[in-house]
């Protein structure tokens, strides 16, 4: 069987990474620190009332490339930043909400002329 790091992409880190977690701490976290084979992240998004909420934590290697790509989601303002350069590197990530577009002010199928 292949050992860690010998498999095909995505390439596993040779060692576990520790990240700060907030509002996103898994059961195996301790003292707001989680562990991962992937990335640390910090994310900002609007809740249902439009209030910005910051969460941070760990992303596993599987699928994290996609999750860390900050692809816009229609009708949802959010931004995510990921890092791997050191333990708890996400303490220093400060993503900001993308600016409101005109259409974000409008509900339903009403369009500006």
């Amino acid at each position: 069987k292949k050992e860690d790091g010998e498999s095909t992409a995505p390439t596993a880190r040779p060692k576990v990474l520790r990240c700060k977690c907030h509002h996103h701490c898994p059961e195996d976290s301790v003292n707001n620190i989680c562990s991962t084979d992937g990335y640390c992240f910090t994310m900002i998004e609007e809740d249902d009332s439009g209030t910005p909420v910051v969460t941070s934590g760990c992303l596993g290697l599987e699928g994290s490339d996609f999750q860390c790509r900050d692809t816009p989601i229609p009708h949802q303002r959010r931004s995510i930043e990921c890092c791997t350069e050191r333990n708890e590197c996400n303490k220093d990530l400060h993503p900001t909400l993308p600016p409101l577009k005109d259409r974000d002010f409008v509900d339903g199928p009403i369009h500006h002329k």
Epitope: P14, K15, V30, G60
Partner: antibody, heavy 116, light 112 residues
Framework: QVQLQQPGAELVKPGASVKLSCKAS????????MQWVKQRPGQGLEWIGE????????LYNQKFKGKATLTVDTSSSTAYMQLSSLTSEDSAVYFC?????????WGQGTTLTVSS | DVVMTQTPLSLPVSLGDQASISCRSS???????????LHWYLQKPGQSPKLLIY???NRFSGVPDRFSGSGSGTDFTLKISRVEAEDLGVYFC?????????FGSGTKLEIK
């Protein structure tokens, strides 16, 4: 090949401190965590804590906080564990071990004897 | 802390026999990444432990294929298909899913 060299034995007096060393070779020192494990005669293994040599980030077993302090010297690829306020309960074999997601390689261990 | 319970404490075997060691954890060892960080080590008298099996069932480099690991969640087993003299010693299971990492109390494999 991976080697973790530890002194064979240390004899210290109660109340004193000791700094145990672990010299790593055969791999990139900063690419793996270094863990420390305690084994008392005829007893099991106890995890003390770990240090990431790339940023000196440490995690400790709550039980050993205040007792053990982990440090590294990356220039010599050496990890250290200082044990303070020693008592007979600290007499044990102390292993350093290379850790990625599990302990892959262990040092031979240092036998610490605390005695007046 | 996660308690690792190993059985039996002592396992007398004849050379060539199959040996089986059980390890139970007090909570699930499935990590949030999906990996299960349960490992097996062998410690011979006067030596440091050596890694045999990592992440439940993966043999470490140089470990003979007579060693195999299985299990999931909280129940794990190490099997030695045909015990050889060099296999004698104390076997420990260990988990690195939850901090602090913990070890089983050990199973002593000895000649009957």
């Amino acid at each position: 090949q991976v080697q973790l060299q530890q002194p064979g034995a240390e004899l210290v007096k109660p109340g004193a401190s000791v700094k145990l060393s672990c010299k790593a070779s055969g791999y990139t020192f900063t690419s793996y965590w270094m863990q420390w494990v305690k084994q008392r005669p005829g007893q099991g293994l106890e995890w003390i804590g770990e240090i990431d040599p790339s940023d000196s980030y440490t995690l400790y077993n709550q039980k050993f906080k205040g007792k053990a302090t982990l440090t590294v010297d990356t220039s010599s690829s050496t990890a250290y564990m200082q044990l303070s306020s020693l008592t007979s309960e600290d007499s044990a074999v102390y292993f350093c071990a290379r850790f990625g997601y599990y302990i892959e390689y262990w040092g031979q261990g240092t036998t610490l004897t605390v005695s007046s | 802390d996660v308690v690792m319970t190993q059985t039996p404490l002592s396992l007398p075997v004849s050379l060539g026999d199959q040996a089986s060691i059980s390890c139970r954890s007090s909570q699930s060892l499935v990590h949030s990444t999906g990996n299960t960080y349960l490992h097996w080590y062998l410690q011979k008298p006067g030596q440091s432990p050596k890694l045999l099996i990592y992440k439940v069932s993966n043999r470490f480099s140089g470990v003979p294929d007579r060693f195999s690991g299985s299990g999931s969640g909280t129940d794990f087993t190490l099997k030695i298909s045909r015990v050889e003299a060099e296999d004698l010693g104390v076997y420990f299971c260990s988990q690195s899913t939850h901090v602090p990492f913990t070890f089983g109390s050990g199973t002593k494999l000895e000649i009957k």
